[in-house]
């Protein structure tokens, strides 16, 4: 197959592929907001076999504007073509296409996490799915950012094996009675733009010395 992707602006929809909780999620938006489909059907093929366009079963006649393609898109070495059809009843309102290389086009959403503050350290508990397919690891590394009083420190914990199950990291040597904020994200080896999680903040409890000083008052 051959394909060209010129910089045209009249494609009727825009697509985005994201790794969300280690699931490949394709989402789309319509450029023309006067078109209001009642449902969509998503089809795809691989670049090398464009005539083999097939319907994504769980995204046929769907009312959602996203589709989980984890079980369909396995290869980071293949280019995929997506075709979206929008309908109102039985009438096709539009059809549009986009070309994806997962390794290039995938954006990596941050994992869920919780923090618990102690006197001089913070436990960061990162939640990964219990099982993550090998091909969805994407040579990702976990980054935990610690912020306090305008200073940002990056932590890159080494994760043995693959990113699955819950993972706990301890940020230590912290100052008691100080506010710390933490963000986590996944960093790709290709230095793609990262999506950082919203900050979660905690005020560490005072240490023993300040506690005794308080009680002396």
């Amino acid at each position: 197959i051959s394909y060209d992707s010129p910089d045209y602006t009249d494609e009727s929809c825009t697509f985005k592929i994201s790794l969300r909780n280690f699931r490949s999620i394709l989402s789309w938006e319509l450029k023309n907001h006067s078109i209001v489909p009642t449902h969509y059907t998503l089809l795809y093929t691989i670049m090398s076999k464009p005539e083999d366009l097939k319907v994504v079963k769980n995204c046929a006649n769907t009312t959602r504007s996203f589709c989980d393609l984890t079980d369909e898109w396995r290869s980071t070495h293949e280019a995929y073509v997506t075709v979206l059809e929008g309908f109102s009843g039985n009438t096709t309102l539009f059809s549009c296409s986009h070309n994806f290389w997962l390794a290039i086009d995938m954006s990596f959403e941050p994992p869920e996490f919780e923090i618990v503050g102690f006197t001089n350290h913070i436990n960061v508990m990162v939640k990964f799915p219990s099982i993550v397919e090998e091909e969805l690891q994407f040579d990702l590394s976990l980054v935990i950012e610690e912020q306090s009083e305008g200073i940002v420190k990056k932590h890159k914990p080494e994760i043995k094996g693959n990113m699955s199950g819950n993972f706990t990291y301890i940020i230590d040597k912290l100052i008691p009675n100080t506010n710390y904020c933490v963000s986590v994200y996944l960093e790709h080896s290709d230095e793609q733009a990262v999506i950082k999680s919203p900050l979660k903040c905690t005020l560490l409890p005072p240490g023993q010395e300040s506690e005794s000083a308080e009680s002396a008052k």
Epitope: D4, P6, Y8, D10, I35, E51, F94, S95, S97, N99
Partner: nanobody, 119 residues
Framework: QVQLQESGGGSVQPGGSLRLSCAAS????????MSWVRQAPGKGLEWVSA???????YYTDSVKGRFTISRDNAKNTLYLQLNSLKTEDTAMYYC?????????????PGQGTQVTVSS
């Protein structure tokens, strides 16, 4: 309703060229992927090429590098430039709304345009 009118076919010798056109009406042309499909004598319909409203183009391997699909959204017209024609390109050529898929898509509504390649 959707109307598609193909033209530009003819008889040429191997290695020759033709330019097919498809005039579309009855729908917002730029909102749709458009396809070219063909039917060789005694065979079923075969997908040849597709182009999105934004200009992404796709070709089956047998025509790659020889055929070029294009569109003019202002004129509601789809084109297929056929170069380096081979005898196996002999077929009736049809344009179709959306990406045509065998077994899923309806037969193209137009009359088609005949391309004959022979020496």
């Amino acid at each position: 309703q959707v109307q598609l009118q193909e033209s530009g076919g003819g008889s040429v010798q191997p290695g020759g060229s033709l330019r097919l056109s498809c005039a579309a009406s009855g729908f917002t042309f730029s909102n749709y992927i458009m396809s070219w499909v063909r039917q060789a004598p005694g065979k079923g319909l075969e997908w040849v090429s597709a182009i999105s409203g934004g200009g992404n183009t796709y070709y089956t391997d047998s025509v790659k590098g020889r055929f070029t699909i294009s569109r003019d959204n202002a004129k509601n017209t789809l084109y297929l430039q056929l170069n380096s024609l081979k005898t196996e390109d002999t077929a009736m050529y049809y344009c179709a709304q959306n990406w045509w898929v065998a077994g899923r898509s309806p037969n193209p509504p137009g009359q088609g345009t005949q391309v004959t390649v022979s020496s």
